[in-house]
Interface confidence: low
């Protein structure tokens, strides 16, 4: 049945009308408007942009648009006492200092309030000592250093290259290794694609470019001072010593020109293998300390940033549903940027703006969606997903009862090669069906569907003829909705060719060079990829809000549950002797997955056959679909991570950006051979299998016939 039957509207107000209203030229215009000055969270400029968006969304025709403010912990450099790193000689004289700012891009020389590169939430301090190069500072890199190479990082300043994992995990790993400071740098191997010029002549990172970013380990807590509750006017705030997720050692980021000066003098151990070498003309020696001639020189960090409780502002727009106003489909993306935000976030915010305008146009012509659509412009995402998390904490009771889906809308592009989608398995079929109806913007795929170009360029590793869809991890504003509240979530953007471009993220990520011109000149001059992303995000929202039966297929969850159960069983089977000794069995989990598969199959059959003209039965079936994601939530959360409550998916404990399946079992098994008390460790594995099996079985039962 077509979507428009729900609200008795004229046939022209269907998905096609919504999609046809989306215009690349408007997205381009909005991007320009949003990127002319910095919009750092907590600043007046970002408050003014919030008010502008509020005003424009009202003009576009939304029913209401409100600002929701919170007072959260943010972090800023000291304007009169800049952060930097020195090489000091034996007399303590500074013989080299890193740069205090990035050279501004052409045309932006006179822009004020460009925050210099810093690691948000770094404590103050001036540690000095020998340097140890720790590669990407991943868990496995520290294993290599400590276990294989017998190098002790205790009391050392470590230097790590950006990439592969979230920077907060790097800092946590360094802390656990005993380091007293961390220097983060962008290596050309990861942030300089071969054959491309540096900005402003291309999209590569120049030597003076630096990646900003927060270094928190919040594990979904939101504002560090008010975990679990909104940072409102009457909030009780923790003391800074009890704040969640703050680093305990000074951290600072630098570019590769400055990194060269630090790394070229490194002595000590040679790199263990080629995977530890980047592209600078340095030996990539691990250290500790400098080589012969320079062995008396040390590195000193000077960090003076401050943590401050600051007001932030979300913009929340509402388009009331005509039939089920108490069912919410949410489209949200952040507004705050580190500097100009040319890609992150404004390429996403511009797309949201155009989606709102298109929905508003339809509404002005008399149309309404079946369900309520909420639009959000989040603040302080860059400081730890704070705006979205505080709003969700404030509205958690409404969201857990009424939330149908959340679609994220950060950066629309990180490349211009093909589509990239991460979502709940419930949305696989929605994404497949939608992309089959959209035109591919890719060269060589004229007249072909987006599904076809996406599948060709990014094939599924498991299913031939289908595109890759990844697990949701974190590092963006869907986190609280999916990982904490269990609301079906998804995200889509255009991405690079991961096969040929092995650098991490895009080269100019979080640098001053992420400008409007970067996008307009190098990534998407015609804004055709932005338009495609608008069609995907907007099309998903349209279908989720307007289809009579929710476009969720529970059978796809059954398929992945089997895959994840096999995967975690295989990991456990690396320890066959211990599994025997401690009587570890996965039978309960496989049995629960089998039951889920059978019940999901029967539910899907009933979904085809029931009387859709009966509003009570329709609502009942839709509620079973809506609440399925919720059924995977464990109210007790994961061990030591109470705000990660989804039993099937959580951000990896080793990389916040990546999703891990059956994370409770995975973490219990991780490095289990090194645990001092194997009996206790394997007992925890068994407990986690029990929790997972129970949760899958309980979720299955929500799909059974109700009586």
């Amino acid at each position: 049945k077509s979507s428009n039957e729900a609200t008795n509207i004229t046939p022209k107000h269907n998905m096609k009308a919504f999609l046809d209203e989306l215009k690349a030229e408007n997205i381009k215009k909005f991007l320009y408007n949003f990127t002319q000055i910095p919009h750092l969270a907590g600043t007046e400029q970002n408050f003014q942009l919030a008010k502008q968006i509020q005003s424009q969304w009202k003009e576009f025709g939304l029913d209401s648009v409100e600002l929701a403010h919170y007072d959260v912990l943010l972090s800023y450099p000291n304007k009169t006492h800049p952060n930097y790193i020195s090489i000091i000689n034996e007399d303590g004289n500074e013989i080299f200092n890193t740069s205090l700012f990035e050279p501004p891009p052409p045309g932006y020389e006179n822009v004020s309030d460009i925050v210099p590169p810093f690691s948000a939430f770094s404590p103050q301090g001036m540690p000095e000592g020998d340097l140890v190069y720790v590669n990407y500072a991943r868990t496995e890199d520290f294993f290599k250093l400590e276990r294989d190479m017998k190098i002790n990082c205790s009391g050392k300043i470590v230097i790590a290259r950006y990439g592969k994992v979230f920077r907060g995990n790097k800092v946590k790993n360094a802390q656990l290794a005993g380091a007293k400071g961390v220097i983060l740098y962008s290596d050309p191997a990861d942030y300089f694609a071969p054959g491309v010029k540096s900005y402003p002549d291309g999209w590569n990172l120049p030597g003076g470019g630096v990646q900003r970013g927060n270094i928190l380990n919040l594990n979904g807590a939101g504002d560090p001072l008010t975990p679990g509750y909104p940072a409102n006017e009457y909030a009780y705030r923790r003391g800074i010593a009890e704040a969640v997720g703050l680093p305990s050692i000074p951290v600072h980021p630098i570019g590769y020109y400055d990194a060269q000066k630090l790394l070229e003098k490194m002595g000590g151990s040679a790199p263990p293998d080629s995977s530890w070498r980047g592209s600078l003309k340095v030996p990539y020696n691990v250290g500790p300390g400098f080589t012969g001639n320079f062995s008396t020189q040390k590195v000193k960090m000077h960090i003076h940033s401050t943590n401050e409780v600051t007001r932030i502002y979300n913009v929340i727009g509402t388009l009331r549903g005509a039939v089920e106003p108490d069912r919410y489909v949410i489209l949200g993306g952040h507004r705050d940027s580190w500097v100009f935000g040319g890609i992150d976030p404004q390429s996403g915010a511009a797309v949201v703006h155009e989606i709102v305008r298109s929905f508003g146009t339809l509404k002005k012509e008399g149309w309404r969606p079946r369900r309520t659509i909420l639009f959000a412009s989040w603040d302080a995402e860059e400081f730890g997903l704070l705006g979205s998390t505080e709003w969700a904490e404030e509205n958690s009771r409404l969201l857990q009862e009424r939330g149908v889906a959340y679609i994220n809308a950060d950066s629309s592009i990180e490349g211009n090669y093909t589509l990239r989608v991460d979502c709940t398995p419930l949305m696989y079929s929605l994404v497949h069906n939608l992309t089959k109806e959209l035109k591919s913007p890719d060269e060589g795929f004229e007249g072909k569907s987006l599904y076809e170009s996406w599948t060709k360029k990014s094939p599924s590793p498991e299913f031939s003829g289908m595109p890759r869809i990844s697990k949701l991890g974190s590092g963006n504003d869907f986190e609280v909705f999916f990982q904490r509240l269990g609301i079906a979530s998804g995200r889509a953007r255009y991405t690079k060719n991961w096969e040929t471009n092995k650098f991490s993220g895009y080269p100019l990520y979080h640098s001053v060079y992420e400008t409007y011109e970067l996008v307009e000149k190098f990534y998407d001059p015609m804004f055709k990829y932005h338009l495609t992303v608008a069609q995907v995000r907007g099309g998903m929202v349209f279908e989720l809000a307007n289809s009579i039966v929710l476009p969720f297929d529970c059978r796809d969850y059954a398929v992945v549950l089997r895959k994840y159960a096999d995967k975690i069983y295989s990991i456990s089977m690396k320890h066959p002797q211990e599994m025997k000794t401690y009587s570890v069995s996965f039978d309960s989990l496989f049995s629960a997955v089998k039951n889920f598969t059978e019940i999901a199959s029967k539910f899907s059959e009933r979904l085809q056959d029931f009387d859709k003209s009966n509003p009570i039965v329709l609502r009942m079936m839709n509620d079973q679909l809506m609440f399925l994601e919720r059924a995977f939530i464990d109210p007790l959360g994961l061990p030591d991570r109470p705000f990660y409550r989804h039993v099937i998916y959580a951000p990896s404990s080793h990389n916040k950006y990546a999703g891990e399946s059956f994370p409770g079992i995975y973490d219990a098994l991780f490095d289990i051979e090194s645990k001092v008390d194997p009996s206790k460790a394997w007992g925890e594995v068994k407990r986690q299998i029990y929790v997972a099996a129970f949760t899958v079985q309980a979720a299955a039962e929500t799909l059974s016939e109700v009586a």
Epitope: E462, Y569, S570, I571, M573, K574
Partner: nanobody, 124 residues
Framework: EVQLLESGGGVVQPGRSLRLSCAAS????????MHWVRQAPGKEREWVAV????????YYADSVKGRFTISRDNSKNTLYLQMNSLRAEDTAVYYC?????????????????RGQGTLVTVSS
């Protein structure tokens, strides 16, 4: 106990073919990806090919692409490697190896067990 037993090696002339087999026992063969790896005298071990648990996905090293074919028979718990157009540089001990996972993508390959190997010598 996991056991992998390779067979089918021998001396063969360049341009000719050979078919290696690997009989697996001690684990649920149909639930795991399987690999062939090889080691030439005095050289590092080289990954050759992987086949997913159900045979639906196969990946090959560039050096053997188009000449070698990996296959499996889950009913017989056996892995195969059909080697055509053999070259002198294919001379090596060939090992079959069990993946720790489903073996569905070359980026996620880690073998936890491998066999004793079978020697293939390509010489005129």
């Amino acid at each position: 106990e996991v056991q992998l037993l390779e067979s089918g090696g021998g001396v063969v002339q360049p341009g000719r073919s050979l078919r290696l087999s690997c009989a697996a026992s001690g684990f649920s063969f149909s639930g795991y990806g399987m690999h062939w790896v090889r080691q030439a005298p005095g050289k590092e071990r080289e990954w050759v090919a992987v086949i997913s648990y159900d045979g639906s996905n196969k990946y090959y090293a560039d050096s053997v692409k188009g000449r070698f074919t990996i296959s499996r028979d889950n009913s017989k718990n056996t892995l195969y490697l059909q080697m055509n157009s053999l070259r002198a540089e294919d001379t090596a001990v060939y090992y079959c190896a069990k993946d720790a996972n489903w073996g569905q993508h070359p980026d996620h390959t880690s073998f936890d067990y491998r066999g004793q190997g079978t020697l293939v010598t390509v010489s005129s």
